[in-house]
C-alpha cells in the first residue's frame, strides 16, 4: 500500500549536468541547458515529485510527473520508460507499482540520488546515450559506482 503525501517541484540533472525534460513527443531526454534555458523550457523541465508513505518501507517512495497540457506520470511498465497521461494517484493498493520509485541518497554523496523501481528490484532510472540523444531508461545496476544511475534533484519550490 502506498499513500500520497506532499509533492515538490524539482529539476533533475544527470551527473554531466544535463537537464531532464520531456520533449514534444512525450519522451524523457537529457540536454545541456543553461539556467535560463531551463527556465525558458518550463514546464517541460519541471518535474512534480510526489512522496508516498509505504506500508512496507523500503526507502522514500515517489512518483515523477510533469504538467504540460495535462499531467503525465513516469512509468516503467515492462521495464520500458514512458510518461503515461495520469495524475499520481492518492492511493495504490499494492506493494509494487510501475509508477513508484524509491528515491535513494547515495551514501557519502548526500546530493546524489538514485531512483529504484518498486516493480523491478535492482533496476534504476539511468541516462543512456542512443545516437545523438541522451535518454532516460530503466537499467539493472551492473557495475559498482555506475554514474549513469545517479542524478541531482534541485527543488524549485
Amino acid at each position: 500500500y502506498f499513500g500520497k503525501l506532499e509533492s515538490k517541484l524539482s529539476v533533475i540533472r544527470n551527473l554531466n549536468d544535463q537537464v531532464l525534460f520531456i520533449d514534444q513527443g512525450n519522451r524523457p531526454l537529457f540536454e545541456d541547458m543553461t539556467d535560463s534555458d531551463c527556465r525558458d523550457n518550463a514546464p517541460r523541465t519541471i518535474f512534480i515529485i510526489s512522496m508516498y508513505k509505504d506500508s512496507q518501507p523500503r526507502g522514500m517512495a515517489v512518483t515523477i510527473s510533469v504538467k504540460c497540457e495535462k499531467i503525465s506520470t513516469l512509468s516503467c511498465e515492462n521495464k520500458i520508460i514512458s510518461f503515461k497521461e495520469m495524475n499520481p494517484p492518492d492511493n495504490i493498493k499494492d506493494t509494487k507499482s510501475d509508477i513508484i520509485f524509491f528515491q535513494r541518497s547515495v551514501p557519502g554523496h548526500d546530493n546524489k540520488m538514485q531512483f529504484e523501481s518498486s516493480s523491478y528490484e535492482g533496476y534504476f532510472l539511468a541516462c543512456e546515450k542512443e545516437r545523438d540523444l541522451f535518454k532516460l531508461i530503466l537499467k539493472k545496476e551492473d557495475e559498482l559506482g555506475d554514474r549513469s544511475i545517479m542524478f541531482t534533484v534541485q527543488n524549485e519550490d
Epitope: M51, K53, P57, G59, M60, R104, V106, P107
Partner: antibody, heavy 119, light 110 residues
Framework: EVQLVQSGAEVKKPGSSVKVSCKAS????????ISWVRQAPGQGLEWMGN????????YYAQKFQGRVTITADESTSTAYMELSSLRSEDTAVYYC????????????WGQGTLVTVSS | DIVLTQPPSVSGAPGQRVTISCSGS????????VNWYQQLPGTAPKLLIY???HRPSGVPDRFSGSKSGTSASLAITGLQSEDEADYYC???????????FGGGTKLTVL
C-alpha cells in the same frame, strides 16, 4: 556533511524511563529515516526501531514493542527515543543512526549516549 | 537472539588479506541485502559496505563485500594497523521490517 548530535549520559533507577535526543544538522531531516541501535557493554549491536519523519511512521523491533517510543520534531530536526520500565539489562550505549539510502542502511551515526540503569 | 553468525575474532599481519564470514538463512541474507559496519575502539559504528558490495565514498577499495546464497563475506586486503576494529554484518527482513546484526568479529592486526 550530515551530523547527528545526541544528548548526554544518563543514570536511571530501575522501573523509570529515559528519553534520549538526536539532533540532525545538514541534509533534509524529513527525507530520511532515523533508527535507534543500542550496544550493551562488550556486546554487539541491537536495532530497536526507527521513525520515518516524512510519513510519520514509527517501527519497533518486536523485543522492544510496548516499551520504546520513537518520535521526531521536524521543526527542530530532532528525533527522540524513550525507553520505559528500565531494568539493569538496559544499561548500554544508545546510538541514533540516519538512513538516507534505505531505512535500514545506517550511513551516519550519532556519537552515542550511555544510559546506566542502577539502583 | 543473534541470527547472523560471525567468527568472534580474526587476525592477520600488516599487508595480508583477511576475510570475515557472516552466515544467515533464507529469511535474511538468502533473500535480502547485506551491509557491513566497522567500529573502531570507543567510537560509533561506520558504514563500510552496503547492498552486498557497494562502498560509500571515502571507504578505501581495500574493503570489499560479497554474497552467495545465505552467506556473506567481507574481505580486507593490504591489512593496516588502523583496520583493527570490530566488524558487524547486518541484513534485514522486509516483511517483518526489522533488521538483524551479526555478533561482531574482532580484527587484530598482528
Amino acid at each position: 556533511e550530515v551530523q547527528l548530535v545526541q544528548s548526554g549520559a544518563e543514570v536511571k533507577k530501575p522501573g523509570s524511563s529515559v528519553k534520549v535526543s538526536c539532533k540532525a544538522s545538514g541534509g533534509t531531516f524529513n527525507s530520511y529515516a532515523i533508527s535507534w541501535v543500542r550496544q550493551a557493554p562488550g556486546q554487539g549491536l541491537e536495532w530497536m526501531g526507527n521513525i520515518i519523519p516524512y510519513s510519520g511512521f514509527a517501527y519497533y523491533a518486536q523485543k522492544f514493542q510496548g516499551r520504546v517510543t520513537i518520535t521526531a520534531d521536524e521543526s527542530t530536526s530532532t528525533a527522540y527515543m524513550e525507553l520505559s520500565s528500565l531494568r539493569s539489562e538496559d544499561t548500554a550505549v544508545y546510538y541514533c543512526a540516519r538512513a538516507a539510502y534505505h531505512p535500514l542502511v545506517f550511513d551516519n551515526w550519532g556519537q552515542g549516549t550511555l544510559v546506566t540503569v542502577s539502583s | 537472539d543473534i541470527v547472523l553468525t560471525q567468527p568472534p575474532s580474526v587476525s592477520g599481519a600488516p599487508g595480508q588479506r583477511v576475510t570475515i564470514s557472516c552466515s544467515g538463512s533464507s529469511s535474511n541474507i538468502g533473500n535480502h541485502y547485506v551491509n557491513w559496519y566497522q567500529q573502531l575502539p570507543g567510537t560509533a559504528p561506520k558504514l563500510l559496505i552496503y547492498r552486498n558490495n557497494h562502498r560509500p565514498s571515502g571507504v578505501p577499495d581495500r574493503f570489499s563485500g560479497s554474497k552467495s546464497g545465505t552467506s556473506a563475506s567481507l574481505a580486507i586486503t593490504g591489512l593496516q594497523s588502523e583496520d583493527e576494529a570490530d566488524y558487524y554484518c547486518q541484513s534485514w527482513d522486509y516483511s517483518g521490517f526489522s533488521t538483524v546484526f551479526g555478533g561482531g568479529t574482532k580484527l587484530t592486526v598482528l
